[in-house]
């Protein structure tokens, strides 16, 4: 059986709004007031076990205490309303749960969705937290009838248990009803089918075309409601390797199609697709995207014919030269498919022509000292490129006109080349590279210009704190032009050591200093200068600083009889490096003087 | 590696015929021409007939024009050297050569590069 409470808290069940004051009493029963000898005096109010002060407690009679709480902010509290009986022990009256929150809001943004194959479904904006309770509730009806309810779960949406009926409007709105308050949002009119989010597209197919390489052609299949629906569509694409997506325009594809071909593509490339679809009116919602279907448009013959260059071997004898004829293979943007074969022509005079089929992208002919016109045309399946001409001028010919002002200079990590051109008008230009070194052939590469080029970068893999030797030669119609070379670094370092110093030449006051060259495999930049440190045991350090042209320097005033010790640095843009540490002594005596 | 390889070589009476084949093989594009050159003891290599293994051109010495044909057979890699109104003179060391040098055709020895091992030829009265 159990115990009847000594007395009762009213309200039982507060529900207070947040920022407001909020009092409560608790009413002690007779019986309880004779059994303990206790009056509303003896009340102590708690809230989560600690005692409210006194000055919010009102003793309102015999039998009645009340408590007043201002700006009541915490989301839910413990009120116990507790007796001192017999003077200190304090004994549990009544408790009840003090709960604070807000009235709804009005709910806004209400927006319905009408998910091809499922039941609408409704969302909407609550508005700020309630910290309640708070039932929210979908209502829809026709003008003539009522829908069930529906009872949301999250407060923000919910989906209705009834199929939508297409081409008839319905109304439908949100109640909000806690503790503190009711309130309705307005409400929407529409016709379910302006609602709908179709299925996605499926069974995207690409295929290509044997006429055209700058097209492909896409089917799909559309469902819209089992055909119900005319739905216009939104095709994207991308090259396979690209992360952004082109847009076909709108205007494109606005009426209802299962198909469609996209224009202006460039050949050999394969190219991602995707499909989404809406209403033809626009109305509703865009499906998500199809799953993603790929194609390769068709080869088209090489748009450009390979960059072309040719080494002359030295002659075996007099009577013909040997001629390495060099190709680059053209990027997959101009080649326009797998590049079968290069033909190269070979012509003397109108008389003689050689014809070569060639798989590589070289080929070594012996010339008389003859001149020459070779041409050069790649090949893939569907036809030969235009063809690259090169004039091979009898080695008799001096090669006349060169570029001027040759410059090259380090920028944003690559290694820049400009020039001012020939005054003769030039078919292209040809820069050659390698990195010199003492310990290894110079290995060249090449890359070719066009004539209207005169500042580009090179385009290999450059190494940095290497020595390069860049030539730049002019192309004309009748064979190549003077070349100019230059040094240069993609980044230079202090060099990797200094350079060892010895006396040539050894006298009472001074001494003749020579040093070699830092090989260039250790130079890592320009050599600007040198210092040259020099003391003697007890004296202070004289430094002196030599241009890098010299190979000597003298130092004079020095001491007779003393040992000098001498150091050397050289240094680029980028720092110096000290060379080992040499000792001399300067003689006691002149040649030739006595003591 | 490139080979040429002469046959047909042998003894024959002044005005009769023979007929001298040689094969090539090994080579990585086609010789531009090719040539029958021959040597007697003491003397030097001189030029007899040449042909383009392309278009077919053909040049000869004159000390051999009317009577010596060169030919070819592209299809087994041969080239041939047909011989009538043999004459003394023509006794020596017969050579097939090759070249990849790009020119008109000629018999100037020096633009061969490969060189066959050479059949003998021996006219007799």
């Known amino acids: 059986q159990l115990l009847e409470p000594c007395g009762y808290i009213y309200p039982e069940f507060p529900v207070v709004q947040r920022g407001s004051n909020f009092t409560a009493i608790c009413v002690l029963k007779e019986a309880c007031l004779q059994h303990y000898y206790v009056n509303a005096s003896y009340i102590v109010w708690k809230t989560n076990h600690a005692a409210v002060p006194r000055e919010q407690v009102t003793v309102i009679n015999r039998t009645t205490s009340s408590v007043t709480f201002t700006d009541v902010v915490l989301p839910s509290v413990q009120l116990t309303c507790n007796i001192l009986s017999f003077g200190q022990i304090e004994q549990n009256v009544y408790g009840v749960t003090m709960l604070s929150g807000f009235p709804p809001d009005k709910p806004t943004n209400l927006t319905c969705i009408v998910n091809e194959g499922k039941n609408m479904l409704c969302q909407w904006d609550p508005g700020r937290e309630t910290y309640l309770e708070t039932n929210y509730t979908l209502k829809s009806e026709w003008a003539t009838e009522k829908f069930p309810d529906c009872q949301s779960k999250h407060g923000t949406s919910c989906m209705v248990s009834y199929m939508p009926t297409y081409y008839v409007n319905i109304e439908v709105w949100v109640e909000a009803e806690n503790a503190l308050g009711k309130v309705s949002s307005e409400s929407i009119n529409f016709d379910p089918v302006d609602k709908v989010k179709p299925t996605p597209p499926y069974n995207l197919s690409v295929t290509n075309s044997e006429e055209l390489s700058s097209i492909l052609k896409l089917s799909w299949v559309s469902s819209g409601l089992g055909g119900l629906l005319d739905l216009k569509s939104d095709i994207q694409y991308r090259t396979k390797d690209a992360s952004t997506w082109i847009q076909v325009p709108l205007e494109d594809t606005m009426s209802p199609r299962t198909s469609f071909t996209v224009q202006d593509l460039k050949p050999f490339t394969e190219y991602v697709f995707r499909i989404r679809s809406i209403k033809d009116s626009g109305k509703g919602y865009w499906s998500d995207w199809s799953e993603e279907a790929s194609g390769t448009t068709y080869e088209d013959r090489p748009s450009r014919p390979p960059s072309f260059w040719y080494k002359t071997n030295p002659s075996h004898g007099q009577e013909y030269r040997s001629v390495r004829l060099i190709w680059k293979a053209l990027p997959l943007s101009e080649a326009n498919g797998k590049i079968l074969d290069y033909e190269v022509i070979l012509t003397q005079s109108k008389s003689v022509s050689q014809t070569y089929t060639v798989t590589g992208t070289e080929l070594t002919v012996n010339l008389t000292n003859d001149r020459y016109v070779a041409s050069l045309a790649a090949r893939n399946k569907v036809g030969k490129s235009a063809a690259a001409v090169l004039t091979i001028p009898s080695p008799h010919v001096t090669a006349a006109y060169s570029v001027v002002n040759l410059k090259a200079f380090p920028k944003d990590n690559l290694l820049w080349v400009e020039w001012t051109p020939p005054p003769k008008p030039v078919s292209k230009y040809i820069l050659e590279w390698c990195v010199l070194s003492e310990n290894a052939p110079c290995v060249e590469d090449w890359q070719q210009e066009d004539a209207t080029v005169n500042r580009t970068h090179l385009r290999g893999r450059l190494l940095e704190s290497k020595c390069y030797q860049i030539t730049v030669t002019p192309v004309f119609a009748t064979g190549p032009g003077g070349s100019e070379s230059l040094k240069a670094y993609l980044k230079q370092a202090a060099p990797a050591r200094g350079p060892t110093v010895r006396t040539k030449k050894v006298g009472k006051n001074e001494a003749v200093l020579a040093w070699d060259q830092i090989p260039v495999d250790d130079q890592n930049g320009f050599i600007r200068n040198y210092s040259i440190s020099y003391r003697t045991s007890v004296g202070k350090e004289m430094v002196v600083h030599v241009d890098s042209s010299h190979t000597e320097y003298t130092l004079s005033s020095l001491s007779s009889d003393t040992l000098y010790m001498v150091r050397m640095a050289a240094y680029t843009d980028e720092g110096g490096k000290d060379g080992p540490e040499f000792t001399f002594t300067t003689p006691k005596f002149a040649q030739g003087e006595i003591e | 590696q490139v080979q040429l390889q002469e046959s047909g070589g042998g003894s024959v009476q002044a005005g009769g015929s023979l007929r001298l084949s040689c094969v090539i093989s090994?080579?990585?594009?086609?010789?531009?021409?090719m040539g029958w050159f021959r040597q007697v003891l003491g003397k030097e290599r001189e030029g007899v007939a040449a042909i383009t293994t392309g278009g077919g051109s053909t040049l000869y010495a004159d000390s051999v024009k009317g009577r010596f044909t060169i030919s070819q057979d592209s299809s087994k890699n041969t080239v041939y050297l047909e011989m009538n109104g043999l004459k003394l003179e023509d006794t020596g060391m017969y050579y097939c050569?090759?070249?990849?040098?790009?020119?008109?055709?000629?018999?100037?020895?020096?633009?061969?590069?490969?060189w066959g091992q050479g059949t003998q030829v021996t006219v007799s009265s």
């Open positions: 050569a090759a070249t990849t040098v790009i020119t008109s055709v000629s018999i100037n020895r020096n633009l061969y590069q490969y």
């Open positions: 090994g080579f990585t594009y086609r010789p531009t021409f």
